[in-house]
């Protein structure tokens, strides 16, 4: 005798998150009178999808009118599939009893679940970092599934090869992540570099997610020193200027010192931006040279973004005659400030 | 679809007596087939639903009072010893209740039994 | 065993009246919903009208109409015809399969 089937003609159904899963199912035959249940997963953990019989399942709609008279189709459609949804669902026949006992078992549909990775994040290292060092950067893309994905490293548009990629977990899952770590390594011009992060995945229609790090948030570019004496200003005023060129980021601070003593500091306020995203400062100094006896030590002192300070000195003779100083010309004065010393 | 009864007649107590039920234009491997019974001046009352082999049932007070069987295109209802209380029309069919109710019925056939 | 109390045992109505039979279950049928109401007249096979407690059958008038849930149940005729003269019984269904018991039946008279 031909006895009730229970069909589920699809072994495997992908569905992207967001849309609804239709798993088909029907059976061949009315009898045994009994409830069509819908599970995920197999043996006594198994997790009740639908159940004909009773029960609120929000998300689930039948394909066909379940109660119509000699309905044979118990497809089901799960509506906002996500990653979590994954699995295998049977379709089972139950036979109406005190308890309902089960009485034949569709072989199951797999529903895979393809899920987009988030936005890549892309974070450099905590503290910055000179040039021709090596620094880190890692990526991190989440929630994504199935699990094939590749990822891509650039700077300015060129691809970087010293990277290392993990995808997590190795087993199945519902959804996994990546996480790469590249080592990029820093020259002076890098203000205005960026660093791309880009991913790849089946869900992205081959329209890739980008995560980018500018390296003006990595990179610490010092400054280079010189201090130079101007033309006489005025008879018995000798002009010096510290030239503060190709640093960054901007915050720095000035200390003259005048043999050793602290003579004034002052924080760098209207800088210059040169086109590789560094910055140039001057400051200068009216010595009135009258006041002085001996030879005068007149010292640049820079301390930048936190760093050492450095410095830069320049020995200024009194017993020659101001006119005779040094003729050098500052190529810059734009943000000078002067001040004198009496 | 439609389902028509035979074999009622007189019989007297306890001389077996089987009833078939003919189906046409559905599978009997996908409906059971249900018989109900109405004795004179008294109202319907289930006797029992014959599917497969396994899936045959009888209400408890019709068990051991009845057996059912079927081929591909008819179903066997067997009063195996009437009673005076058996006198009734029997109708069959289609359905096995709950989502899949009885319908269509047969026309009836009556079976009275007296000595 | 489920017992099905079904009331009024008769019950008359004018033609565009409204009739109503009530069925009442020793306990809750199967699923809450294992019930349905059939027609029937002398000398003809009972009808199906309503499954699954208020499921209406195919080809059958919108004036029938069936509610309840557990062990209420009932059927409402509104808008009652000549030809809706008849008895009309409930069919419940207990937990197990062949637990499946007719009510007593209400007959129906237009006058």
């Known amino acids: 005798e031909e006895e009730l089937q229970v069909i589920q003609p699809d072994k495997s159904v992908s569905v992207a998150a967001g849309e609804s899963a239709i798993l088909h199912c029907t059976v061949t035959s009315l009898i045994p009178v009994g409830p069509i249940q819908w599970f995920r997963g197999a043996g006594p953990a198994r997790e009740l999808i639908y159940n004909q019989k009773e029960g609120h399942f929000p998300r689930v709609t039948t394909v066909s009118e379940s109660t119509k008279r000699e309905n044979m189709d118990f497809s089901i459609s799960i509506s906002n599939i996500t990653p979590a949804d994954a699995g295998t669902y049977y379709c089972v026949k139950f036979r109406k009893g005190s308890p309902d006992t089960e009485f034949k078992s569709g072989a199951g549909t797999e529903l895979s679940v393809r899920a987009k990775p988030s936005a890549p994040v892309v974070s450099g290292p905590a503290a910055r970092a000179t040039p021709q060092h090596t620094v880190s950067f890692t990526c991190e893309s989440h929630g994504f599934s199935p699990r094939d994905i590749t990822l891509k490293w650039f700077k300015n548009g060129n691809e970087l090869s010293d990277f290392q990629t993990n995808v997590d977990p190795v087993g199945e899952s519902v959804s996994y992540s990546i996480h790469s770590t590249a080592k990029v390594v820093l020259t002076r011009e890098d203000v205005h570099s960026q660093v791309i992060c880009e991913v790849a995945h089946v869900t992205l229609q081959g329209d890739p997610l980008r995560g980018t790090a500018n390296l003006s948030e990595t990179i610490r570019v010092p400054p280079t020193l010189e201090v130079t004496q101007q033309p006489v200003r005025a008879e018995n005023q000798v002009n010096v200027t510290c030239q503060v060129r190709k640093f960054y980021p901007q915050r720095l601070q000035l200390t003259w010192l005048e043999n050793g003593n602290v003579s004034r500091t002052e924080t760098a306020s209207t800088v210059t931006e040169n086109k590789d995203g560094t910055y140039n400062w001057m400051s200068w100094l009216l010595v009135n040279v009258s006041a002085h006896r001996d030879d005068v030590k007149l010292t640049c002192q820079v301390e930048h973004d936190g760093q050492p300070a450095v410095s830069k000195s320049h020995d200024l003779k009194v017993s020659a005659h101001p006119k005779e100083q040094g003729s050098n010309t500052a190529a810059e004065n734009t943000g000078s400030n002067e001040r004198n010393i009496y | 679809r439609s389902v028509e009864e035979s074999g009622g007649r007189l019989v007297t107590p306890g001389t077996p007596l089987t009833l078939t039920c003919t189906v046409s234009?559905?599978?009997?491997?996908?409906?059971?087939i249900s018989w109900v019974r109405q004795a004179p001046g008294k109202g319907l009352e289930y006797i029992g639903t014959?599917?497969?082999?396994?899936i045959t049932y009888f209400a408890s007070w019709a068990k051991g009072r009845f057996t059912g069987s079927k081929t591909s295109t008819t179903v066997d209802l067997k009063i195996t010893s009437p009673t005076t209380e058996d006198t009734a029309t029997y109708f069959c069919?289609?359905?096995?209740?709950?989502?899949?109710?009885?319908?269509?019925w047969g026309p009836g056939t009556l079976v009275t039994v007296s000595s | 065993a489920l017992v099905m109390t079904q009331t009024p045992a008769s019950v008359s109505a004018a033609v565009g009246g409204t009739v109503t039979t009530k069925c009442q279950a020793s306990?809750?049928?199967?699923?809450?919903?294992?019930l349905a109401w059939y027609q029937h007249k002398p000398g003809q096979p009972p009808k199906l009208l309503i499954y699954?407690?208020?499921t209406l059958a195919t080809g059958v008038p919108s004036r029938f109409s069936g509610s309840g849930s557990g062990t209420q149940f009932t059927l409402t005729i509104t808008g009652v015809q000549s030809d809706d003269a008849a008895t009309y019984y409930c069919?419940?269904?207990?937990?197990?399969?062949?637990?499946?018991?007719f009510g007593g039946g209400t007959e129906v008279v237009v006058k």
């Open positions: 069919a289609r359905g096995s209740a709950w989502n899949d109710p009885f319908d269509p």
């Open positions: 234009g559905f599978s009997l491997s996908s409906h059971g």
């Open positions: 014959i599917g497969t082999g396994v």
């Open positions: 306990q809750s049928v199967y699923g809450n919903n294992d």
């Open positions: 699954l407690a208020s």
């Open positions: 069919l419940g269904g207990g937990d197990d399969e062949a637990d499946n018991v």
